[in-house]
């Protein structure tokens, strides 16, 4: 009976999902058979997020909405180990809208989940961000500095990157 | 006072080149996108070109891609316009004006005169 | 890229009446509360004028006879109560993303 209700609830769990994602991969959390961690195919996963590159190029807001169809929004980096994951999945030549702007021109940064912006870890180039108009961020690759974030123009279409939360079933 | 003026038109064999100019004054030049925007004689607005402040970015439509090239000189306070392979459907006022950003987009502030091109044989 | 539908394409108002200009934007041109829609004013032989910005903005130095309002899709340009010299095109323009795109234009008349 137990069992019954538990198969019962994941089911129901995974069809509110099935709309926007028709097949999830799930692995086992820790040593409960009972306890499954899953994200859409083909999203990668680290620590307890799922992220999606979509190389659709398009606007920033776009791609915030483009996220949030699927459950998610763009990406939101809180630690370097995050970056270091999410670059392995990136293309050198390429830019990919972070879910961090300045929309008002103040250097106000926010995230669009609200986490607090903490200047303590960002990973800007060197030299930005440095134009009061370009109020959203991407992640680059620059030579002489690796992976780093640059500030540009929000309508300039872009590739992008989406982060949701862990589904648990 | 802001003032935008356009020069450079004029009339040219279909395949033939042109350069616009915009001489800008009465604001910080160099702080501010800028863009050209057309009117065939009798048409409504489409857009031809933007140059971001820095001069980091350009864009164009389908339409002038290949053709047509935006630039500017800072320290002249001017913006250009290079056009080549003229078409008949090239003829238009060609408009210069300023962007002032507004959150995660735009508007045209302040519009040139305008500068008449003329593509015909 | 997104496409402004502007209507009517030309109306003729006496003055002291009001002018209702409508835009229909083929996908949401709104993010968050900020509606990224704007109006211009073109009168014959001159350049367009900035009027409203981000949908319901009145550019200074223009008259508060002139008023913008909606969201998504649907915005609409006011003229109340229009005045002899307001004979003009009228354009509205998306800036949400590139490229940056016009409606076709209303051609307002004074009876």
């Known amino acids: 009976n137990f069992m019954y209700s538990k198969t019962v609830k994941r089911l129901s769990k995974l069809r509110e999902y099935q709309q926007y994602h028709p097949s999830l991969t799930c692995v086992m959390e820790g040593k409960d058979i009972e306890d499954w961690s899953c994200c859409p195919t083909p999203w990668t996963s680290f620590q307890s997020s799922c992220y999606f590159i979509s190389t659709g190029m398009q606007s920033w807001t776009k791609s915030q909405k483009n996220c949030s169809v699927m459950g998610a929004d763009l990406v939101v980096i809180n630690t370097r180990e995050e970056q270091d994951f999410i670059i392995q999945n990136l293309k050198r030549n390429s830019s990919y809208f972070l879910g961090l702007s300045d929309p008002g021109g103040r250097r106000h940064w926010q995230w669009v989940d609200q986490t607090p912006y903490n200047e303590n870890v960002t990973f800007w180039h060197s030299g930005e961000p440095n134009n009061l108009d370009e109020r959203c961020a991407i992640i680059n690759f620059r030579s002489s500095e690796e992976w780093g974030w640059n500030d540009i123009h929000c309508h300039v279409p872009q590739k992008s990157i989406c982060k949701m939360k862990k589904i648990y079933i | 006072e802001v003032q935008l003026v356009e020069s450079g038109g004029g009339l040219v064999k279909p395949g033939g080149s042109l350069r616009l100019s915009c001489a800008a004054s009465?604001?910080?030049?160099?702080?501010?996108?800028m863009s050209w925007v057309r009117q065939a004689p009798g048409k409504g607005l489409e857009w031809v070109s933007t140059?971001?402040?820095?001069?980091?970015?350009?864009y164009y439509p389908d339409s002038v891609k290949g053709r047509f090239t935006i630039s500017r000189d800072n320290a002249k306070n001017s913006l250009y316009l290079q056009m080549n392979s003229l078409r008949a459907e090239d003829t238009a006022v060609y408009y210069c004006?300023?962007?002032?950003?507004?959150?995660?987009?735009?508007?045209?502030?302040?519009w040139g005169q305008g500068t008449t091109v003329t593509v015909s044989s | 890229d997104i496409v402004l539908t502007q209507s009517p394409a030309s109306l003729a108002v006496s003055p002291g009446q009001r002018a209702t200009i409508t835009c229909r934007a083929s996908?949401?041109?709104?993010?968050?509360?900020?509606?990224?829609m704007h109006w211009y004013q073109q009168k014959p032989g001159q350049p367009p004028k900035l009027l409203i910005y981000?949908?319901?903005n009145l550019e200074s130095g223009v008259p508060a006879r002139f008023s913008g309002s909606g969201s998504g899709t649907d915005f609409t340009l006011t003229i109340n109560p229009v005045e002899a010299n307001d004979a003009a095109n009228y354009y509205c323009?998306?800036?949400?993303?590139?490229?940056?795109?016009f409606g076709g234009g209303t051609k307002v008349e004074i009876k």
């Open positions: 996908e949401s041109v709104s993010f968050h509360g900020t509606h990224l």
């Open positions: 323009q998306q800036s949400i993303e590139d490229p940056p795109t």
């Open positions: 004006a300023r962007q002032l950003y507004y959150s995660y987009g735009y508007y045209f502030d302040y």
């Open positions: 981000a949908a319901s």
């Open positions: 140059i971001s402040s820095g001069d980091s970015y350009t």
């Open positions: 009465g604001f910080t030049f160099s702080s501010y996108g």
